[in-house]
């Protein structure tokens, strides 16, 4: 190799200056004894190279790019060789930003997959390869004192969420959890969450059903619906409150909310609806009175209210 580039830093803050040096060895005898070293950033020639002959006979050109405004570019030094430009060496330059503090870190405990799923917002684009790591530890108290560290959780590329499996969790005990972001320009850490995985539990919703008409039960009145629900079995022993929502199937009506209902109600008569109208109903639940996350809304149940009974006009005869 006849030439070699060295740079002050191959990765800089976007807009920062960068200094580069290109040295041409003396033993490249086929070259012009006083060659003019040229600089190119991407496809553009860059003026301003200061060239000098060193005591050992090598030629050096130094250039300062006042602002590197490209997030990625190749810087090359070259010589005119006949009618063409002979590239001696090139380096990749990267520019970007250090990672912003990850924010809006939140977690939920999924009892079916037995994992604590945490997600966050990574902040603005850094233009550099940036790694995120979900870090955590077990704590007996309120996370002021750190207990056993938990294996780092590294999300798949481009994802802003990570799952901590059950074997690294202790239920009914606090955990300190935070996200660390790192790239070539720096490291940042989100504020730490301190939580008991059970306090962020997200249950599955109950299954809505039509109430089976029993011979002794009165049929629903006009504008009423009788429905029941089957609790999600794995969450059966968790105290919960639930809420229903309903809307007519036709038209543009928005959802109407009914609640809170205790999960234990298991059946409900919903009144005040339009008679002879098809309704869509859904239910969701949350651990309560202890903390938790609302479940998703259940699959829809579609039911029709009964018709209003015909009104009988009684004619009174006066004698």
């Amino acid at each position: 190799e006849c030439g070699h580039i060295s740079v002050s830093a191959p990765i800089v803050h976007l807009g920062d200056p960068i200094t580069a040096s290109c040295i041409i060895k003396q033993n490249c005898s086929h070259l012009d004894p006083e060659p003019q070293i040229l600089w190119r950033l991407g496809a553009e020639l860059q003026p301003g190279g200061r060239q000098q002959r060193l005591s050992d006979g090598t030629q050096e050109s130094i250039i300062t790019l006042p602002h590197l405004n490209h997030t990625q570019a190749f810087l090359s030094c070259a010589l005119n060789w006949g009618n063409s430009l002979q590239i001696l060496d090139q380096v990749e330059l990267r520019a970007g930003y250090p990672p912003a503090i990850p924010h809006n870190l939140s977690c939920l405990m999924n009892l079916t997959t037995s994992s604590l799923i945490c997600q966050w917002e990574p902040g603005p684009e850094t233009h550099l390869p940036t790694s995120f790591t979900l870090k955590s530890f077990k704590s007996r108290g309120n996370c002021q004192t750190q207990g056993d560290s938990i294996l780092d959780c590294v999300p798949k590329d481009g994802q802003s969420h990570c799952s901590i499996p059950r074997k690294h969790l202790l239920l009914y005990q606090n955990m300190g959890i935070w996200v660390q972001a790192e790239n070539a320009l720096g490291t940042s850490m989100s504020p730490q969450l301190c939580l008991d995985p059970m306090d962020v539990v997200k249950l599955e919703p109950p299954m809505l059903r039509t109430m089976d008409p029993s011979p002794e039960a009165a049929p629903p009145q006009a504008g009423c619906l009788q429905l029941s629900w089957e609790p999600w079995q794995p969450g059966l022993h968790i105290n919960q409150k639930c809420e229903l929502r309903h809307k007519p199937q036709r038209g543009e009506a928005s959802w109407a909310l009914v609640g809170p209902l205790p999960l234990e109600a298991l059946q409900y008569e919903l009144c005040g609806l339009l008679p002879a109208t098809a309704y869509t109903l859904q239910i969701r639940c949350i651990r309560w009175p202890l903390p938790g996350h609302w479940s998703d809304w259940s699959p829809s149940l579609e039911l029709r209210t009964t018709e209003r009974a015909p009104t009988h006009h009684h004619h009174h005869h006066h004698h």
Partner: antibody, heavy 118, light 107 residues
């Protein structure tokens, strides 16, 4: 300290009835599911029934469905098991249990023996 | 109903031995598997809940693992007070069901 104290066991004839009680202390009784588990002499554990914190949900084992009724009085911190139409195979030590949110039995009473025999 | 099959039904071991008891569910139960220890004439005692969570006050030589249908209780170094009968129990759905038990005896 959590304490569960069963009472009401004894000798009863087949077809007879018995009511077991479990007095609870040391925790907020009204917030927990409670249950009954039995163990026949020399045998393993068998879940009988559970009851939700306010009494609205009461699953039963098939072997006792329609004959046993679980109930609770949160004002008295007491769990009950009304056992009717008793059979010889109901002979067992009956344990009262405080259940955790994941269905595990956090605490157990010392048990009360029910013997069904003529 | 979910059936729970425990094995072995009994085993002989010495103090200091590593002991492993397995429990298999007839269908997937996620992590809803609990382990209890019972000594003669006494009520059962909770050791492990939700497959791997050690109940407060239980020595760390007890550990649980597994998910889905296959679960394991391990006693890393058997102590004299550990000779007892051990039961697994699923709490994924009612009826709650127990395994048949494993009696750990002194060799």
């Amino acid at each position: 300290e959590v304490q569960l104290l069963e009472s009401g066991g004894g000798l009863v004839q087949p077809g007879g009835s018995l009511r077991l009680s479990c007095a609870a202390s040391g925790f907020t009784f009204s917030l927990y599911w409670m249950g009954w588990v039995r163990q026949a002499p020399g045998k393993g554990l068998e879940w009988v029934s559970s009851i939700s914190s306010s009494g609205g949900v009461t699953p039963y084992a098939d072997s006792v469905k329609g004959r046993f009724t679980i109930s609770r009085d949160n004002s008295k911190n007491t769990l009950y098991l009304q056992m009717n139409s008793l059979r010889a195979e109901d002979t067992a030590v009956y344990y009262c249990a405080k259940l955790g949110e994941l269905g595990h039995s956090l605490a157990w009473g010392q048990g009360t023996l029910v013997t069904v025999s003529s | 109903d979910i059936q729970m099959t425990q094995s072995p039904s009994s085993l002989s071991a010495s103090v200091g031995d590593r002991v492993t008891i397995t429990c298999r569910a007839s269908q997937g139960i996620s992590s809803y598997l609990n382990w209890y220890q019972q000594k003669p004439g006494k009520a059962p005692k909770l050791l492990i809940y939700y497959a791997s969570n050690l109940q407060n006050g239980v020595p760390s030589r007890f550990s649980g693992s597994g998910s889905g249908t296959d679960f394991t209780l391990t006693i890393s170094s058997l102590q004299p007070e550990d000779f007892a009968t051990y039961y697994c129990q699923q709490s994924y759905s009612t009826p709650l069901t127990f395994g048949g038990g494993t009696k750990v005896e002194i060799k």
